[in-house]
């Protein structure tokens, strides 16, 4: 399904992208009145240094070697923030003293900026995409993915890190946003809502989709995630909206069928390698792109976001499994793990298609 560019052709429901329109304050609930399950803030953790919290957990990237049995990845600190299904909060709870971003959650105090000052930055993610306001940029060529097809063995680590389900990716998954803009995929994770409540991070014309996948990449110009954090283009995330369709998505089922094994926060399992590209839309030529940030602490900016125009379809049962299986901190369900949309503050969202 694709997102209609023109208002008239589209009730959002099929597409997967949006335009540039900063959400106003009205979209961000205040700490006091923000429900825990609403739109929590949060993004991908980038593994790397123990003290670097991040998008979901980003693995540390090491030099290529012929025997890369597995990428070692340190989980970035976790943060939680209060959120509202459609109006998440930018708050995080820090369990440790000092500038430790490793413990956060969606909903709760203190505000994320106290956990990581960058969370109060001017160019944050996610954002609301307004296709009609997007600037067509002919220079945005089809994305190129290489090495995303993985044999069943070795297996990959699938982990419930308390704020998402994350699949650690092995070395060799290469992605190019264009000539000279090359990246290596590190991990992918999902954001979702709750029964009957959507949970994508980005929105399109204010429409929130059921869920969203993020594939986090490190620029080949950097050897480690911590070196790339905050650097323009140091990290790149491919994002796609997930919505309900009539059939089971066999690619996603390979992961969703294993969620029961990692229902408990901090648990992990091994899953057979799969075609990672099959988790993304098939149309790599139509997308929106803008510069933003990680959607969870440390909220580092300079992240290149590429949001596919085409959506990915999952069955109703699969979407239910995604939102209703995992548990987060304490006795709370891991649901509504998305951050409120952030103001564009003058940023222009570009589109690869007219």
């Amino acid at each position: 399904q694709r997102l209609p560019r023109m208002q008239e052709d589209s009730p959002l429901g099929g597409g997967s992208s949006g335009e540039d329109d900063p959400l106003g304050e009205e979209d961000l609930p205040s700490e006091e009145d923000s429900p825990r399950e609403e739109d929590p803030p949060g993004e991908e953790d980038l593994p790397g240094e123990e003290d670097l919290p991040g998008e979901e957990d980003l693995p540390e990237v090491k030099p290529k070697s012929e025997e890369e049995g597995s990428l070692k990845l340190e989980d970035l600190p976790t943060v939680e923030a209060p959120g509202d299904p459609q109006e998440p909060q930018n708050n995080a709870h820090r369990d440790k003293e000092g500038d430790d971003q490793s413990h956060w959650r969606y909903g709760g105090d203190p505000p994320w900026p106290r956990v990581s000052p960058a969370c109060a930055g001017r160019f944050q993610s996610p954002v609301d995409i307004r296709p009609q306001l997007a600037a067509f940029c002919p220079a945005l060529r089809p994305l190129e993915l290489l090495g995303f097809q993985l044999p069943p063995l070795p297996e990959l680590r699938l982990r419930n890190n308390g704020h998402s389900v994350q699949l650690t990716l092995p070395p060799g998954l290469e992605m190019a946003l264009g000539p000279g803009r090359e990246y290596r995929a590190l991990q992918l994770h999902l954001h979702w809502g709750a029964a009957g409540r959507p949970g994508s991070e980005h929105t399109v014309e204010g429409h929130r989709f059921p869920a969203e996948i993020h594939v986090v990449h490190l620029s080949t110009a950097f050897a480690r995630v911590d070196e790339a954090l905050g650097r323009p283009g140091g990290l790149a995330v491919l994002a796609a909206f997930l919505e309900e369709g009539p059939e089971e998505n066999s690619a996603y089922e390979q992961l969703l069928s294993r969620l029961e094994e990692i229902a408990e926060e901090g648990s992990e399992t091994q899953v057979p390698g799969l075609d990672i590209s099959a988790l993304l839309p098939s149309d790599f030529s139509r997308y929106f792109q803008y510069e933003g940030s990680l959607t969870t602490p440390p909220c580092a900016q300079g992240v290149i976001w590429t949001v596919f125009n085409q959506t990915v379809m999952l069955s109703a049962k699969q979407l239910h499994t995604l939102s209703d299986t995992l548990w987060g901190p304490g006795d709370s369900r891991l649901q509504l793990n998305f951050r409120a949309t952030q103001p564009l503050n003058g940023r222009v969202i570009e589109a690869s298609f007219p």
Partner: antibody, heavy 119, light 111 residues
Framework: QVQLVQSGGGLVQPGGSLRLSCAAS????????MSWVRQAPGKGLEWVSA????????YYADSVKGRFTISRDNSKNTLYLQMNSLRAEDTAVYYC????????????WGQGTMVTVSS | QSVLTQPPSVSGAPGQRVTISCTGS?????????VHWYQQLPGTAPKLLIY???NRPSGVPDRFSGSKSGTSASLAIIGLQADDEADYYC???????????FGGGTKLTVL
């Protein structure tokens, strides 16, 4: 030193059974998937079976499915291939190999052990 | 018959350049799965020569290089030496057959 040392080959009659072993050393065996690959006399390489690092998932070539069983004992750093209902066409040198490379390559190989099925 | 097709034999004089091709299909090489190359010297176990289409394990001379395009891959050897005489195999994964598969092998003769 990283190595895989094989044992258990020999002569067996058609319909008979044999168990091959592959002892690993020099690397964290329990963290790696493993495979068996065979080579009939004067022929090319043929993948036979594979097993995940924790032993929970196994894969077999159609030619051996239902007759061969791959297993591992991570406490002993050893990989096994139980071969039952052997046929003449199973005659080959059997190699154990490490599936350690994420791109699907076999990067460490055993020295090979000859299995001859003949009456 | 192997689903990955290699020429049975190739030859070259010392110092020359030779290439060995490996042709697959849309369910293996063409599907995006990597191609790996092995060298098997007479009477020994195979040795990984190239992995992930183009990468050399440590210890493998840079005279050996791999490439991949579409449903085919190739191994190139420059500055051919007498001790390069061996059998060479390509290998990939096939998502339809669900097997790790090898090419039929190519015997390299150094003249």
């Amino acid at each position: 030193q990283v190595q895989l040392v094989q044992s258990g080959g020999g002569l067996v009659q058609p319909g008979g059974s044999l168990r091959l072993s592959c002892a690993a050393s020099g690397f964290p065996f329990s963290s790696y998937a493993m495979s068996w690959v065979r080579q009939a006399p004067g022929k090319g390489l043929e993948w036979v079976s594979a097993i995940s690092a924790n032993g929970g998932t196994t894969y077999y070539a159609d030619s051996v499915k239902g007759r061969f069983t791959i297993s591992r004992d991570n406490s002993k750093n050893t990989l096994y291939l139980q071969m039952n209902s052997l046929r003449a066409e199973d005659t080959a040198v059997y190699y154990c190999a490490n599936n350690g490379n994420y791109r699907g390559a076999f990067d460490i190989w055993g020295q090979g052990t000859m299995v001859t099925v003949s009456s | 018959q192997s689903v990955l097709t290699q020429p049975p034999s190739v030859s070259g004089a010392p110092g020359q350049r030779v290439t060995i091709s490996c042709t697959g299909s849309s369910s293996n090489i063409g599907a995006g799965y990597d191609v790996h190359w092995y060298q098997q010297l007479p009477g020994t176990a195979p040795k990984l020569l190239i992995y992930g289409n183009t990468n050399r394990p440590s210890g493998v001379p840079d005279r050996f290089s791999g490439s991949k395009s579409g449903t085919s891959a190739s191994l190139a050897i420059i500055g051919l030496q007498a001790d390069d005489e061996a059998d060479y195999y390509c290998q990939s994964y096939d998502s339809t057959l669900r097997v790790w598969m090898f090419g039929g092998g190519t015997k390299l003769t150094v003249l």
